[in-house]
């Protein structure tokens, strides 16, 4: 999916609101300095394409973040302010459900979900010194 | 862990080519952009060229435009820098390096390099 | 083309302060970022964003950056920060890094 064509503003008003307390949430108890930075975005469509790719894809170790409240909210954020973005999703649901696991909490899990911050918040604040 | 390992240095004619490789582990590779950067001998560290994550943007220094070309494979973990007509002023170490970066719809800029490899010799001579 | 511009040399006492500076045409508009390099060992970013410290770099290494200057300051100066120190920032499409800055713990 292009998410070129997303209302960013409104992207970032969801994760300022909910999606980043929820991140908090999930991450209680860990230093935000335990682990390096592995994955990176370099404006606003790929931050989403990676956080798309983290959130929802199964990695080793990790299976079971698509479940997550802030995975849930990522996901409805991008169905309303993505066009078209739900219909291609429409499969990728269908195929999770068939391999829907026990929720478990790995460290790879908390890992990838301070990866998935990083990328929050370089979507939320570009990198630009003078906006 | 996150490590980027050069090669394909070595000691190469004046006006001939060489071609360094750089390959990455342990970070998510295509969503980096990465730089080279070269040290001459008891010199300071000079930019040479950066390509973004998806390879769509290059740039070069002034020094190697037109002769150095930087590209990446990423189903491979890999940058390139294929170096055609080189010169003694080319001989140095090259660095291969991961860089923050960010662009808009105008530019690209490119920050700092947090990770770096270990460096691979070029000796241009005759 | 832009040029950024630090002290060949700054020497300094083991304990004190040292202050590196790097200066360029309307810096402070750019993030300015700060490598150290020991004899041997590839460059290690110690300052990002002007004033960030990557994990894992000592708490005595800060930077600022403000109208044509960048400043490394190491407080407390210890003798393995004896190094090379480099300044670097983006301009038109180019990276550009100071010419870099030999500190000596004396």
């Known amino acids: 999916y292009d998410f070129t064509n997303c209302d960013f503003e409104k992207i970032k008003a969801a994760y300022l609101s909910t999606i980043s307390k929820d991140l908090i949430t999930y991450m209680s108890g860990t230093k935000s300095t335990e682990f390096n930075n592995t994955v990176s975005c370099s404006n606003r469509p790929h931050c989403l394409t990676e956080i798309q790719s983290l959130t929802f894809n199964p990695t080793a170790g990790c299976a079971s973040l698509a479940k997550e409240m802030f995975a849930m909210k990522t996901k409805a954020a991008l169905a309303i302010w993505c066009p078209g973005y739900s219909e291609t999703q429409i499969n990728a649901t269908q195929a999770m459900k068939k391999r829907r696991k026990r929720k478990v909490t790995t460290n790879k899990c908390l890992e990838q979900v301070s990866q998935l911050q990083g990328l929050w918040r370089r979507f939320n604040r570009p990198l630009l010194k003078q906006q | 862990q996150v490590q980027l390992v050069e090669s394909g240095g070595g000691v190469v004619q004046p006006g001939r080519s060489l071609r360094l490789s750089c390959a990455a582990s342990g970070f998510t590779f295509s969503s980096y952009g990465i730089h080279w950067v070269r040290q001459a001998p008891g010199k300071g560290l000079e930019w040479v060229a950066v390509i973004s994550y998806d390879g769509s943007n290059k740039y070069y220094a002034d020094s190697v435009k037109g002769r150095f070309t930087i590209s990446r494979d990423n189903s491979k973990n890999t940058l390139y820098l294929q170096m055609n007509s080189l010169r003694a002023e080319d001989t140095a170490v090259y660095y291969c390096?991961?860089?923050?970066?960010?662009?808009?719809?105008?530019?690209?800029?490119?920050?700092?390099?947090?990770?770096w490899g270990q460096g691979t010799t070029v000796t241009v001579s005759s | 083309s832009y040029e950024l511009t630090q002290p060949p040399s700054v020497s300094v006492s083991p304990g004190q302060t040292a202050s590196i500076t790097c200066s360029g045409d309307?810096?402070?508009?750019?993030?300015a970022c700060w490598y150290q390099q020991k004899p041997g060992q590839s460059p290690v970013l110690v300052i990002y964003?002007?004033?960030k410290r990557p994990s894992g770099i000592p708490e005595r290494f800060s930077g600022s950056n403000s109208g044509n200057t960048a400043t490394l300051t190491i407080s407390g100066t210890q003798a393995m920060d004896e190094a090379d120190y480099y300044c670097q920032a983006w301009d038109s499409s180019t990276v550009v890094f100071g010419g870099g800055t030999k500190l000596t713990v004396l």
């Open positions: 390096a991961r860089g923050d970066s960010w662009n808009d719809r105008l530019n690209y800029y490119f920050y700092d390099m947090d990770v």
């Open positions: 964003q002007d004033n």
């Open positions: 309307k810096l402070g508009d750019k993030y």
